[in-house]
Amino acid sequence: FNISGCSTKKLLWTYSTRSEEEFVLFCDLPEPQKSHFCHRNRLSPKQVPEHLPFMGSNDLSDVQWYQQPSNGDPLEDIRKSYPHIIQDKCTLHFLTPGVNNSGSYICRPKMIKSPYDVACCVKMILEVKPQTNASCEYSASHKQDLLLGSTGSISCPSLSCQSDAQSPAVTWYKNGKLLSVERSNRIVVDEVYDYHQGTYVCDYTQSDTVSSWTVRAVVQVRTIVGDTKLKPDILDPVEDTLEVELGKPLTISCKARFGFERVFNPVIKWYIKDSDLEWEVSVPEAKSIKSTLKDEIIERNIILEKVTQRDLRRKFVCFVQNSIGNTTQSVQLKEKRG
């Protein structure tokens, strides 16, 4: 199809080479098309549409994304050619940064229902650049945490070194929905609830004498509880003796609950004590069996191919540790009688 009639938007993604970050493109169909379409009323209702009304479908996923190759080849369907780019309804998610994401992206409705709809498309010219170190020493991260129940703020990474007074107007979206009152370089949250978690996008306009473009950053916000003040506790084994049958295989499970820590480095391991000797046992990897906002339960098993007489003289010790401290639970094997 002819893309010369598409409205055009220029975007800049300046990514940090230090951290993983994502990026998104919204299918910004001109008003009133997108309200038919993506159910996202992102502009003022008083803004005059640039195009004739689009008689669109209400199906949220009814848009098609293409990339325009720089060599002039035909448009490529994003879904077929780019595994690191995911389409979610009207949004295109870039899972990994890199200058190779630079290019022109076109979105338009899948279903063309009237002659006017042919021109109902948006061309987004995306420029991707690595961030220069010089700009800002303490720029905000693309992953930000809000402490539940307290006051917090979400900073736009590309503007976090700007004073509030000098910050340009910022357009914020949360999970693709416009936050119309938020126009500053940071969102202040009076009291943090779990619904403040999500994907936030901040846009601002940069211009020179020739043209203007939108600088965009994506922030993943999670809501967290305060770091635990407790060392982990062992939920299993509870008893310090375990009845076993000689010659049979045995699995002993160690389950421990670790309180939330922002920097989480849990340790869970098994070691064996035999008279004056003790050594760590090579056991299968630990696995998380339950994770909540406040804590995580991690399990690690020790597996004996068959229980020997020697095992009855040993102590099997589960050791767990977080940044606060450690806990141990030892198990002595006892032969089943009868």
Epitope: L43, S44, Q47, D164, A165, P168, A169, T171, S180, V181, E182, R183, S184, I187, V188, V189, D190, Y204, T205, Q206, S207, S212
Partner: antibody, heavy 113, light 110 residues
């Protein structure tokens, strides 16, 4: 800096356009607002034009005001002034979050027959 | 429509004293979007406090904003002669069309 102009004496019903001339920053990057103050009275937010050009107005304006902008100016059109519109009109750099960082000195509009 | 009610008005304070101006909102402001302005005769307003409690740059720390939801306070400690002015609160609301200023509180310094 910001500087309003276009104020003066006007007869009721005669459309009037006030202009705010900006320098030192780009209107394509900042939201701009208009606020007015009747003599001896308090401040009233009229409306805001966003960096991208979309406009938001106070509910009491009821379509009597229109905000628009060019490259270095922001206009406030009073479509059909009444005597109640007599006030000093300020333009300010700031948005619908009611954070107005920089203000012009204001221009006085007197509506009288 | 939203209403911001400021009390008391006028208010008087001695030099070196402390004064509090209250601003009550109906309904609640959006998030923490309550600002305070100082205006002297013949001048445009000046932003003092934004987002309820953040001090604008260049504003002395004698000015303090507090509160949330529907109840906000501007406290001026160690009052100076230069603080004589009218103080306005301003609130932002969901949908923006209800955005408004309070009626103002005139402060006289004795």
């Amino acid at each position: 800096s910001l500087k309003e102009s276009g104020g003066g004496l006007v007869t009721p019903g005669t459309p009037l356009t006030l202009t705010c001339k900006v320098s030192g920053f780009s209107l394509s990057s900042y939201d701009m607002s208009w606020v007015r103050q009747a003599p001896g009275k308090g401040l009233e937010w009229i409306g805001t034009i966003y960096d991208g050009g979309s406009t938001y107005y106070a509910s009491w304006t009821k379509g009597r005001f229109t905000i628009s902008k060019a490259s270095t100016t922001v206009d406030l059109k009073i479509t059909s002034p009444t005597t109640e519109d007599t006030a000093t009109y300020f333009c300010a750099r700031g948005s619908t979050n009611m954070e107005f960082w920089f203000w012009g000195p204001g221009t006085l509009v007197s509506v009288s027959s | 429509a939203a209403v911001l009610t400021q009390t008391p008005s006028p208010v008087s304070a001695p030099v070196g004293g402390t004064v509090s101006i209250s601003c009550q909102s109906s309904p609640s402001v959006y998030s923490v979007y309550l600002s305070w302005y100082q205006q002297k005769p013949g001048q445009p307003p000046k932003l003092l406090i934004y987002r309820a409690s953040t001090l604008a740059s260049g504003v002395p720390s004698r000015f303090k904003g507090s509160g949330s939801g529907t109840q906000f306070t501007l406290t001026i400690s160690d009052v100076q002669c230069d603080d004589a002015a009218t103080y306005y609160c301003a609130g932002a609301y969901v949908g923006s069309s209800d955005n408004t200023f309070g009626g103002g509180t005139e402060m006289v310094v004795k």
